[in-house]
């Protein structure tokens, strides 16, 4: 569209230049040309001449009517056919937009990634609006009643320096566009409860050459949080189903987790952690691929007949991947849980 145009007349839109998608729209063109009594007034949409639903109201004015206009954006202009002129003469032009009022923002979540110095809030915006929509994030201290507001397009990062007067806040998001305004539900936030530990990383893995080979996975984090609860999921690259083990971790030293895995197979490992007792998880770490060594002796391998890792807390569950090509986007589809206990020899309790 053309933002600035010298008009020789006027163009206006009913109900307005921004309107709800699917509405009936009338666009008027009124010429004010010198030395021209136009034979015809023409409408163009995105450069193409319109043929239908045009009404000549009087000598200077014409109207085009659209039933259920549903294009998000269009550039309209109108011209006059002046006697004695070879070309049509431009009268005026307008950018028009159609869209929807915003949905109420949903699933508002605020977290502080350790060491980031920011509180990051995200939300679901709902269905597309097709028009410029802004989000106003309200952060109100429950202790001082002071309110801060931040403009955003899809998420917001708020410096924790500006949240020093209080630990408890009420957060909500207001969605605003030309067609309406909606508020999210309010979220109660305690700054101490929303910290996500510094990223956990799997650094290496090795498989021992024992008669019953075991794989040791080494993983670490720079977190300063003392009590951390973690999950490690793993599967063969050919499998859809993840197994998940749970650990209480202390990152003052590198974590070692032992697995008894199928020989001569390529495995994918990922880990994620949260502060113990809190609800916000890290995203899963980058996939770490490890190839187990070939079987040395003839052994009938069974996935659940081997001792588990020797860790303080562990749970193994089956998790099925939606797609083997999307290791980061997995959903818990089944919930068969196997609890491992520190084993002596090959004895295994399953409860």
């Amino acid at each position: 569209g053309i933002t600035s145009i010298n008009c020789s007349g006027d163009m206006w839109v009913e109900p307005g230049e921004i309107f709800q998608m699917g509405m009936n729209v009338s666009i008027y063109c009124q010429e004010a040309l010198k030395h021209c009594r136009p034979r015809n007034l023409y409408f163009y949409k995105n450069g193409f001449k319109e043929e239908f639903d045009i009404t000549r109201i009087n000598r200077t004015t014409a109207r085009i009517w659209y039933k259920g206009f549903s294009e998000p954006h269009a550039y309209m202009h109108c011209t006059a056919e002046c006697p004695g002129h070879f070309q049509e003469t431009l009268i005026c032009g307008k950018d028009i937009s159609s869209g929807h009022p915003p949905d109420a923002p949903s699933n508002l979540t605020c977290v502080i990634y350790e060491y980031s110095g920011n509180m990051t809030c995200t939300w679901n915006t709902g269905k597309p609006t097709y028009i410029d929509t802004k989000y106003i994030v309200h952060v109100k201290s429950l202790e001082t009643e002071e309110e801060q507001q931040y403009l955003a397009s899809s998420y917001v990062k708020i410096s924790t320096d500006s949240l020093q007067g209080s630990r408890k806040y009420l957060v909500w998001v207001q969605a605003v566009n030309s067609l309406g305004m909606e508020n999210s539900q309010q979220l109660h936030v305690h700054l101490d409860d929303i910290v996500i530990p510094s990223a956990s990383i799997i650094s290496r893995a090795e498989t021992t050459n024992d008669t019953v080979p075991k794989t040791i996975v080494y993983w670490k984090s720079k977190t300063m949080i003392e009590k951390v609860f973690c999950e490690m999921r793993y599967k063969t690259t050919t499998n859809q189903t993840w197994s998940v083990k749970e650990f209480d971790a202390n990152f003052t030293y590198v974590q070692q987790s032992e697995f008894y895995l199928e020989p001569d197979s390529k495995y994918v490992f990922q880990v994620r952690c949260q502060e113990t007792g809190k609800r916000n998880w890290q995203p899963w770490s980058s996939p770490f691929v490890h190839q187990t060594s070939q079987e040395t002796g003839k052994r009938n391998w069974q996935p659940w007949s081997s001792p588990f890792v020797h860790q303080t807390s562990q749970t193994v569950s089956q998790v099925t991947a939606k797609s083997s090509h999307e290791p980061q986007k997995m959903e818990m589809l089944s919930a068969t849980i196997f609890r491992g206990h520190p084993a002596s020899g090959n004895h295994q309790d399953i409860g």
Partner: nanobody, 116 residues
């Protein structure tokens, strides 16, 4: 309640420009989100523009591309630059706390009159 004070209004021809200011003694603009609202003769209050503590801005469609909101934290002052003024911009202009809303907190306002 913060006492806000607007200034800079006046009479101008259509197509002309003005800059409105809003100050508040003892008020820290650095952390504040602010807005401008206006009231045309015989009409209700209309939200015009807003700015958050970090300088992100939002505008009503009727003024987008013509008006610019800004603030100078060092001078504790909020501004509204009005360009390409139209007769329909004639109104009393008020500043208020908060990015968005068609209310103000009882300040005196500043009058803008645009003639054709």
């Amino acid at each position: 309640q913060v006492q806000l004070q607007e200034s800079g209004g006046g009479s101008v021809q259509a197509g002309g420009s003005l800059t409105l200011s809003c100050t508040a003694p003892g008020f820290t603009f650095r952390l504040a989100a602010m807005r401008w609202v206006r009231q045309a003769p015989g009409k209700g209050l209309e939200w015009v523009s807003g700015i958050d503590s970090r300088g992100s801005t939002i505008y009503a469609d009727s003024v987008k591309g013509r008006f610019t909101i800004s603030k100078d934290n060092a001078k504790n002052t909020l501004y509204l630059q009005l360009n390409s003024l139209k007769t329909e911009d004639t109104a009393m202009y008020y500043c208020a706390q908060g990015v968005y809303g068609d209310t103000y907190s009882g300040s005196q306002g500043t009058q803008v009159t645009v003639s054709s």
